[in-house]
């Protein structure tokens, strides 16, 4: 058994640019407290996985309220350290999360509201007994300074807090199978420690925090007699087939506790011990309330003090869920319009649009054609969120800067051959074919459907009929 | 300053039914998380039942499988239907709205229930 003990050196702006803003105001007052939340081993599990190996919540902090032009500065914290008992063997590793919570100190009337400002998550290996232990952390713009350690609790020692020591009965030696403790000569070894609550007259353990059962007992603390019948096995308890030492029904049997409460005899019945947020006589009335700090990323709860009083999240963009911490994809409804490209930055979403449109979802059409010139004589056309350009005879390319190969095409019919010509492409017919493309044949009797070619040209010559 | 207006109120008999209504009012919106608290003569103000923002619900122990909360966005208004009510659900219910800089209260709305 032992205690992690964390202590709370300076919260407020990280360095580098874009300060945040203050979380208090001179409307709305408030105050901080933190939350530190324990996990054995160095698992990555989600924030809202139990703290198996115990939380904490500090006191609330001084009444702050912002002074108007002000940069934020540290805040002003809460007195003391955050202590969190283990009961067992401290793990060597961990990890950890710790929450900075602000408390609205307004005018409500439903009594304050509280809201998630930071949460710094990490895994470390830490030995009980060892120094304290400095950190930094940051959380988007601010940071946050602490130090840490895990002490064993008297007489538990060790860097896992399972070897306990005694003082020595007798000056000179320990007793029987009992070592001296290192660093503590003057101190020994001690028997284990059982299970809290082990009968001391029917239990015994072979490890710190087990409760095993002596013949004739039974029950999680060995408190329960064994119901015997008139016949008794040499060896002892034998199976209920054969009618001897049946184990009577125990209360804690089956365990009564809901919602992961846990089951302990008493001497009339059994009492539940129950988790955070949970009460009734089997832990079956949740009573998680805003003080539990219920909301996470940033959610602001809503709700009064009293344990059967409702608590909502309110959440901020981006989450969702009773207790907003379910990530939303919000790209995933397609906000952005003509093909924009979706970008949700948690805080907000953008739009990345492609040419031709802007507005926050891309859904303004551009002119196209608007300070977009065609060279050479081209015309512009719209459409589709880019500018064509029709060009003139002889260019092309997207802006008709090119000159065009006006033979390019092919495009003199019935096998003629193709010239280009400064002002634009000539055609030499094959012969039986006539026309500025050659697209017309020959008469057979010679005569043609065009007039006579002119004075000076054969009929097999370049016609440029134009 | 806008405030919300509650209605639906009275004297029941225990085992009978209300049905709360708030607003219309243009705070009544989907992007708030809005709800009903109560408070009896000497206790504190309570959270019965509320809606977040994100359309999630809850309800006091005390109340859940008896009471429903609903909204409807496009009339602006709010609605806690109250069954199989109690003589300790006697209280002043109170409509509420919020978001992430504001909230906004109801004058309240008082519900007797006789034994």
């Known amino acids: 058994a032992g205690v992690f003990e964390l202590q709370i050196h300076s919260f407020g702006p990280g360095p580098g640019p874009g300060a945040p803003r203050s979380p208090c105001s001179a409307r709305l007052p408030c105050r901080l407290f933190f939350r530190v939340c324990l996990k054995p081993g160095l698992s990555e599990e989600a924030a809202e996985s139990p703290c198996a190996l115990g939380a904490a919540l500090s006191a609330r902090g001084p009444v702050y309220t912002e002074q108007p032009g002000a940069p934020a500065p540290d805040l002003p914290l809460p007195d003391g350290l955050l202590q969190v008992p283990f009961r067992d063997a401290w793990p060597g590793t961990f990890s950890f999360i710790i929450e900075t919570w602000r408390e609205e100190l307004g005018d409500q009337i439903g009594g304050p509201a509280w809201s998630l400002l930071a949460r710094v998550a990490g895994r470390r290996r830490l030995a009980a007994g060892g120094p304290w232990a400095r950190d930094i952390q940051r959380a988007g713009a601010w940071e946050l300074r602490f130090s840490y350690r895990a002490r064993c609790e008297p007489p538990a020692v060790g860097t896992a807090c399972t070897r306990l020591c005694r003082p020595r009965s007798a000056p000179s030696r320990c007793g029987p199978g009992l070592r001296p403790c290192a660093p503590l000569e003057d101190e020994c070894e001690a028997p284990l420690v059982c299970r809290a609550g082990c009968s001391p007259e029917h239990g015994f353990c072979e490890q710190p925090g087990e409760c095993r059962c002596l013949e004739g007992w039974t029950g999680p603390l060995c408190t329960v007699p064994v119901s015997t019948s008139s016949c008794l096995s040499p060896r002892g308890p034998s199976s209920a087939t054969t009618g001897c030492l049946v184990p009577g029904p125990g209360p804690c049997d089956g365990n009564p506790c809901a919602n992961g409460g846990s089951c302990s005899e008493t001497p009339r019945s059994f009492e539940c011990t129950c988790p955070r947020g949970f009460y009734g006589l089997r832990c079956e009335v949740s009573g998680v309330t805003c003080a539990d700090g219920p909301c996470f990323n940033g959610g602001l709860c809503v709700g009064g003090a009293d344990p059967d009083s409702a608590y909502i999240c309110h959440c901020p963009p981006g989450f969702q869920g009773s207790n907003c911490e379910k990530r939303v994809d919000r790209c995933s409804l397609q906000p952005c319009r003509n093909g924009g490209l979706c970008l949700d930055l948690g805080h907000a979403l953008r739009c990345r649009c492609r040419a031709g449109f802007a507005g926050p979802r891309c859904e303004h059409d551009l002119d196209d054609c608007a300070g977009r010139a065609c060279a050479n004589g081209g015309t512009c056309v719209e459409g589709g969120g880019a500018h064509r350009c029709s060009c003139a005879l002889g260019f092309g390319g997207r802006d008709c800067r090119e000159r065009a190969d006006p033979c390019a095409a092919r495009p003199c019919a019935h096998g003629g051959r193709c010239y280009a010509h400064f002002s634009g492409l000539v055609c030499a017919c094959a012969p039986g074919y006539m026309g500025a493309r050659c697209e017309f044949p020959v008469h057979p009797d010679g005569a043609s459907a065009l007039p006579a070619a002119p004075p000076g040209l054969r009929p097999g010559d370049p016609q440029r009929y134009l | 300053e806008v405030q919300l207006q509650e209605s639906g109120g009275g004297l029941v008999q225990a085992g009978g039914s209300l049905r709360l209504s708030c607003g219309p009012s243009?705070?009544?919106?989907?992007?708030?998380?809005v709800g009903w608290w109560r408070q009896a003569p000497g206790k504190q103000r309570n959270l019965v039942a509320g809606?977040?923002?994100?359309?999630?619900?809850n309800y006091a122990q005390s109340v859940k499988g008896r009471f429903t909360i609903s909204r409807d966005n496009a009339k602006n208004t709010l609605f806690l239907q109250m069954n199989s009510l109690k003589p300790e659900d006697t209280a002043v219910y109170y409509c509420?709205?919020?978001?992430?800089?504001?909230?906004?209260w109801g004058r309240g709305t008082q519900v007797t229930v006789k034994p």
């Open positions: 809606i977040s923002n994100v359309g999630s619900t």
């Open positions: 243009e705070i009544i919106t989907s992007d708030k998380s």
């Open positions: 509420y709205a919020r978001d992430f800089e504001n909230e906004y």
